[in-house]
Amino acid sequence: KETAFVEVVLFESSPSGDYTTYTTGLTGRFSRAGATLSAEGEIVQMHPLGLCNNNDEEDLYEYGWVGVVKLEQPELDPKPCLTVLGKAKRAVQRGATAVIFDVSENPEAIDQLNQGSEDPLKRPVVYVKGADAIKLMNIVNKQKVARARIQHRPPRQPTEYFDM
């Protein structure tokens, strides 16, 4: 279970037409349900129930987005339409280049994602929790255009101070 380094850029447009950016990072884990590779795309929040819809025509996005799914407490959805792995597959079928699950409310999902599959997805399936999950949901709740870049090694930072 390797660390996934997620870099997020929020785009803030101004009335004059130009924009500023806000860049941040968070860490998650690559699950065995998907591939440990880099991916990049615009963040699209998906409701877990929204992934139940079988009509793929209805909900197709352009290929190359990063799906963000906040999993609910299992008690709130005792008979889910799809397993967590099934939800990841459905998102990838709809064009997600990667899926990030917030597992804070449903930590059992970690085991489900890491059980190992005969046929793992060819795209990364990442899970986040704690402060990283709060940050991710705060990004989504800003309702701004945001792009995520998922990497399996940390991006080099110019802000580290080395005490010689």
Epitope: T24, L26, G130, A131, D132, I134, K135, N138, T159
Partner: antibody, heavy 118, light 107 residues
């Protein structure tokens, strides 16, 4: 209880650089949160200066972009503010805080007064 | 940048009184508004986040409300420790900005 403590010189000469350190205890600066510098001018005006994320990304207030730098030393659990070419207008109480654009400022240092004067 | 205007800038009040502080933004905030209290000794603590959510340890006499560009902080029954400066702060749009502060003082 998470604590933040600012330190640095209380007096800086105009045109010089202001350098402050924020030492964090009972939380690690790589724990997922963002860490900010905020200043309060005489007369109560408050200004967010910039932040550094748990992953080391920095964001600055556009009004200070060309003069400011925020760095960190994860081994000492500290982050730093450097403000260049200061003028008397930069005299303020400087606070470090946990939080930023993506988190409310939940923990604050006690503040350190910096006066810019020759 | 979003401009935050607080009113009044000074508010004389008595113990046990109910007071309301207002905060108006130059753009819609979608509830991305926080409140802070600065004590006379300079220490700052968070009170509410996302308009109406109490930070842990904050007494229930504090409450927040609002939408769009207009928000308010209400203290239902003033305690001696409530006399301080209150700031609103938006994080709807980058960079985060603060209101000018409201000084709550003993009448």
């Amino acid at each position: 209880e998470i604590q933040l403590q600012e330190s640095g010189p209380g007096l800086v000469k105009p045109s010089q650089s202001l350098s402050l350190t924020c030492s964090v205890t009972d939380d690690t600066i790589t724990s997922g949160y963002d860490w900010s510098w905020i200043r309060k001018f005489p007369g109560n005006k408050m200004e967010w200066m910039g932040d550094i994320s748990s992953s080391g990304h920095t964001n600055y207030n556009p009004s200070l972009q060309i003069r400011i730098s925020i760095t960190r030393d994860t081994s000492k659990n500290q982050f730093f503010l450097q403000l260049n070419s200061v003028t008397t207008e930069d005299s303020a109480t400087y606070y470090c805080a946990r939080g930023g654009f993506l988190f409310p400022f939940t923990f604050w240092g006690q503040g350190t007064l910096v006066t810019v004067s020759s | 940048d979003i401009q935050m205007t607080q009113s009044p800038s000074s508010l004389p009040a008595s113990l046990g009184e109910r007071v309301t502080i207002s905060c108006r933004a130059s753009q819609v905030l979608n509830n991305n508004l926080n409140w802070y209290q600065q004590k006379p000794d300079g220490t700052i603590k968070p009170l509410l986040y996302y308009t109406s959510n109490l930070q842990s340890g904050v007494p229930s006499r504090f409450s927040g409300s609002g939408s769009g560009t207009d928000y308010s902080l209400t203290i239902t029954s003033l305690d001696p420790e409530d006399f301080a400066i209150y700031y609103c702060q938006q994080d709807a749009s980058f960079p985060p900005t603060f209101g000018g502060g409201t000084k709550l003082e003993l009448k």
